[in-house]
Amino acid sequence: LPAQVAFTPYAPEPGSTCRLREYYDQTAQMCCSKCSPGQHAKVFCTKTSDTVCDSCEDSTYTQLWNWVPECLSCGSRCSSDQVETQACTREQNRICTCRPGWYCALSKQEGCRLCAPLRKCRPGFGVARPGTETSDVVCKPCAPGTFSNTTSSTDICRPHQICNVVAIPGNASMDAVCTSTSPTRSMAPGAVHLPQPVSTRSQHTQPTPEPSTAPSTSFLLPMGPSPPAEGSTGD
């Protein structure tokens, strides 16, 4: 004969646990039904009646099967430096992520607590490691034979143009100036790993190899070349 199926609420066998999507109610000492995502327990079960569930109100949610008396509040609206990548529904919290050009400097369980603008490398410095959703740009000094004349969170150090005749040698923040009208380049200017140009040398020495470079952030300073504003919170 098939085993008898118990309907909630029911008293569990000694030493056994309640089934999936059920919970043990200490007061009633019974296995009772959980409420589905998007609902909460309006009335707890008794020995004779099962849990009564009700839908979450606006701006509240439950993501899991539960028996909570009240739904959780959705997080506050996304701040100006964030975009809403998941809306607040009865079954899920709002998720805010940093908008383009920003990264998450301090994460929370879901989404971001603190967004900050990506670092901009100043002239003479190029991007060594690009920013990601969770990490800042890393800048490095342009090595001999390369330059960057921009303030940018994306521009790398580019090779100096190779001149037939050099009018002004290039340096870390300036390209070489040629006297001839048709300079040649050994490779595309945007290429990252390039051979050193032969006829123009930078007027500075090779930077020391920097250790483990990785993401970094932005920085509100009380003075200075107005680095990006300090991050803003997402809750």
């Epitope: 003479g124 490691r129 000094p141 870390a172 500075h204 250790p211 991050g231």
Partner: antibody, heavy 121, light 107 residues
Framework: EVQLQESGGGLVQPGGSLNLSCAAS????????LSWVRQTPEKRLEWVAY????????YYSDTVKGRFTISRDNAKNTLYLQMSSLKSEDTAMYYC??????????????WGQGTTVTVSS | EIVMTQSPASLSLSVGETVTITCRTS??????LPWYQQKQGKSPQLLVY???KLAEGVPSRFSGSESGTQYSLKINSLQSEDFGTYYC?????????FGGGTKLEIK
């Protein structure tokens, strides 16, 4: 108000270890790069170590490379310097400093009050 | 490493006088140079960054200038609170070295 408060200094024998901490407040800690700078008894300043805001990129001066480790805990707003195989020439006042925002804003804009490390037998 | 040669090492001046402290770098550092002031028993404080820009709250009698690999800090009409030690530093390639300092004493 930006505050950087160092602790953990003291007297240690050559070859010994010491851990410095720097508790930060008054700014968004996780968005700033930080460094340790020391000042010798002769009043010379020496940059020791740097860590970027994400805690992944670290640079060291040659004099401490392999012996000192800089780290940070962005959840606790704290910067650390683990010092091992200490030498008499490591004797100095150690400052926790904010910056540089390397490649963008290249300077130390806030300094702590310092903690004294003395390496002597 | 880049060597920062700061001069003079010390000097004694009176209130109202003008002083220029120089820092010569062993190679180009592309203006990545701050100046700091340190008073007795205190931590250094940022005065100038990017060789010529005054930090917030720094009086206009302070000014920074550069010429090639020589960087200068000028203080016009010295005030009593200006006495202390001044340091230059570079932020080009690591290690980021400091000058030896200039101790400015009151005469």
């Amino acid at each position: 108000e930006v505050q950087l408060q160092e602790s953990g200094g003291g007297l240690v024998q050559p070859g010994g270890s010491l851990n410095l901490s720097c508790a930060a407040s008054g700014f968004a800690f996780s968005t700033y790069d930080l460094s340790w700078v020391r000042q010798t008894p002769e009043k010379r300043l020496e940059w020791v170590a740097y860590i970027n805001n994400g805690g992944i990129s670290t640079y060291y001066s040659d004099t401490v490379k392999g012996r000192f480790t800089i780290s940070r805990d962005n959840a606790k707003n704290t910067l650390y310097l683990q010092m091992s195989s200490l030498k008499s020439e490591d004797t100095a006042m150690y400052y926790c400093v904010r910056g540089p925002f390397y490649g963008s804003a290249n300077y130390f804009d806030y300094w702590g009050q310092g903690t004294t490390v003395t390496v002597s037998s | 490493e880049i060597v920062m040669t700061q001069s003079p090492a010390s000097l004694s001046l009176s209130v109202g006088e003008t002083v220029t402290i120089t820092c010569r770098t062993s190679e180009s550092i592309y203006s990545n140079l701050p100046w700091y002031q340190q008073k007795q028993g205190k931590s250094p404080q940022l005065l100038v960054y990017d060789a010529t820009k005054l930090a917030e709250g720094v009086p206009s009698r302070f000014s920074g200038s550069e010429s090639g690999t020589q960087y200068s800090l000028k203080i016009n009409s010295l005030q009593s609170e200006d006495f202390g030690t001044y340091y230059c530093q570079h932020f080009w390639v690591t290690p980021w070295t400091f000058g030896g300092g200039t101790k400015l004493e009151i005469k």
